[in-house]
């Protein structure tokens, strides 16, 4: 799913208010929910009939500095006999996300949003039969 | 996908640097990678064996405003007959993402960071079959 | 240890509706399925639906769609059955029944079931 | 859909006995789906066997499944008195049925 664009409001001060001075704006550490959980641990990505396997890209510079792609392992999905059945297809599922870039000059830190596309997982789809000609 | 915790590093200056005053870090406004685009198959949510609805949340003091969370429509998955089999599972995709939350008193606006889980999609798997009790 | 509770029960007139609860207790809600399962007078036993507290996936019996509608209150950890236009032939105990995770069971794995709510229909 | 049948519809024993109750498929059905359920009056049921041959948590060993494609039995090796009451098979491969019951009776 995507991600609107932010436009000129979000980030800013209401209008009656002074202007946010050189561009940036005030952002609180910590994060709100970090402890909330993800019942996930349950391999599914080898169990579905479009199975995937987890790439991880690692960036310290970016948070999370931990990123996990997924790709599909096959083209057809698997079939009751674990056999690929490619009158199926196996589809990414993808999701943009935020990341913050930490960018530093000696002792000068600042901080910005990323947009990141992250394949999450993939679904088994019948494919849309058309001839072009 | 679980996004680790911030831990007491990532948002820090450098030991040898000032500390970072009253808790918070600048965040500059602008978002890298913004009109980047999600190439996702065409309603795969409808043509997926393991199908899924999507409903949107909707919050003026969060960015992205808009959340989108899917459901799965079936406990069981579609077959090439178009009829419910309820041998095989419907189960939702995952995915922890971070979303930035809008804090304000009269002129003073800041921001702070949020885990949200956010359901993407749904795929079909064959349980694992047997009883925990 | 799992428990369901279900709702007293409940006498009816035709045309009626009524709305069946199964309060669930010593098991994690949201990480299990929840049946509902017909049982009439003389008849064998019937399944009529289930839902994913998680996912939000429900899936009915043919002979059940448009006659039962399965809810859940998660943060209550209860499901409900409606059903609606009810008639004679709807009188029956129904029970609701923990069903699966989807992961580790399937969801259609029926384990633990509630003590049942007879609903009557009657003139 | 897939139509199991019980036999016999009423089976009469005593204490001590052993008690083989089949249900037949009206089509294959993998045993990963069928169960045996127990259900004594005014009771709901009660899960025995899963998978066709594996024992619920807390089951009696003197409960035992077996069958395969469209033939199970469900067998009670020796008979308790608590062991009297109407039993249930029921599968899921293809849509969701329970046979008629089987009724254990004390004779």
């Known amino acids: 799913r995507k991600i609107p664009k932010v436009g000129h409001t979000f980030f800013q001060k209401p209008e009656s208010c002074p202007p946010v001075p050189g561009g940036s704006m005030k952002l609180d550490i910590g994060i709100i929910n970090e402890n909330q959980r993800v019942s996930m641990s349950r391999n599914i990505e080898s169990r579905s009939t479009s199975p995937w396997n987890y790439t991880v890209t690692w960036d310290p510079n970016r948070y999370p500095s931990e990123v996990v792609q997924a790709q599909c392992r096959n083209l057809g999905c698997i079939n009751a006999q674990g056999k690929e059945d490619i009158s199926m297809n196996s589809v990414p599922i993808q999701q943009e996300t935020l990341v913050v870039r930490r960018k530093h000059q000696g002792c000068s830190v600042s901080f910005q949003l990323e947009k990141v596309l992250v394949t999450v997982g993939c679904t088994c789809v019948t494919p849309v039969i058309h001839h072009v000609q | 996908r679980k996004i680790p915790k911030v831990g007491h590093t990532f948002f820090q200056k450098p030991e040898s640097c000032p500390p970072v005053p009253g808790g918070s870090m600048k965040l500059d406004i602008g978002i890298i990678n913004e009109n980047q685009r999600v190439s996702m198959s065409r309603n795969i949510e409808s043509r997926s064996t393991s199908p899924w609805n999507y409903t949107v949340t909707w919050d003026p003091n969060r960015y992205p405003s808009e959340v989108v969370q899917a459901q799965c429509r079936n406990l069981g998955c579609i077959n090439a007959q178009g009829k419910e089999d309820i041998s095989m599972n419907s189960v939702p995709i995952q995915q922890e993402t971070l979303v930035v939350r809008r804090k304000h008193q009269g002129c003073s606006v800041s921001f702070q960071l949020e885990k949200v889980l956010v359901t993407v999609g749904c795929t079909c798997v064959t349980p694992v079959i047997h009883h925990v009790q | 240890q799992v428990q369901l509770v279900q709702s007293g029960a409940e006498v009816k007139k035709p045309g009626a509706s009524v709305k069946v609860s199964c309060k669930a207790s010593g098991y994690t809600f949201n990480e299990y399925t929840m049946h509902w399962v017909k049982q009439a007078p003389g008849q064998r036993l019937e399944w009529m639906g289930g839902?994913?507290?998680?996912?939000?996936?429900?899936s009915y019996n043919q002979n059940f769609k448009g006659k039962a509608t399965l809810t859940v209150d998660t943060s209550a950890s209860t499901a409900y059955m409606e059903l609606s236009s009810l008639r004679s032939e709807d009188t029956a105990v129904y029970y609701c029944a923990r069903g699966g995770d989807g992961y580790y069971t399937n969801y259609f794995d029926i384990d633990y079931w509630g003590q049942g709510t007879t609903v009557t229909v009657s003139s | 859909e897939i139509v199991l049948t019980q036999s016999p519809g009423t089976l009469s024993l005593s204490p001590g006995e052993r008690a083989t109750l089949s249900c037949r498929a009206s089509q294959s059905v993998s045993s990963s789906y069928l169960a045996w359920y127990q259900q004594k009056p005014g009771q709901a049921p009660r899960l025995l066997i899963y998978?066709?041959?594996s024992r619920a948590t807390g089951i009696p060993d003197r409960f035992s499944g077996s069958g395969s494609g469209t033939d199970f039995t469900l067998t009670i090796s020796r008979l308790e008195p608590e062991d009297f009451a109407v039993y249930y098979c029921?599968?899921?491969?293809?849509?969701?049925?329970f046979g008629q019951g089987t009724k254990l009776e004390i004779k």
């Open positions: 998978g066709a041959s």
């Open positions: 029921q599968q899921y491969g293809s849509s969701y049925t």
């Open positions: 839902i994913n507290p998680n996912s939000g996936g429900v």
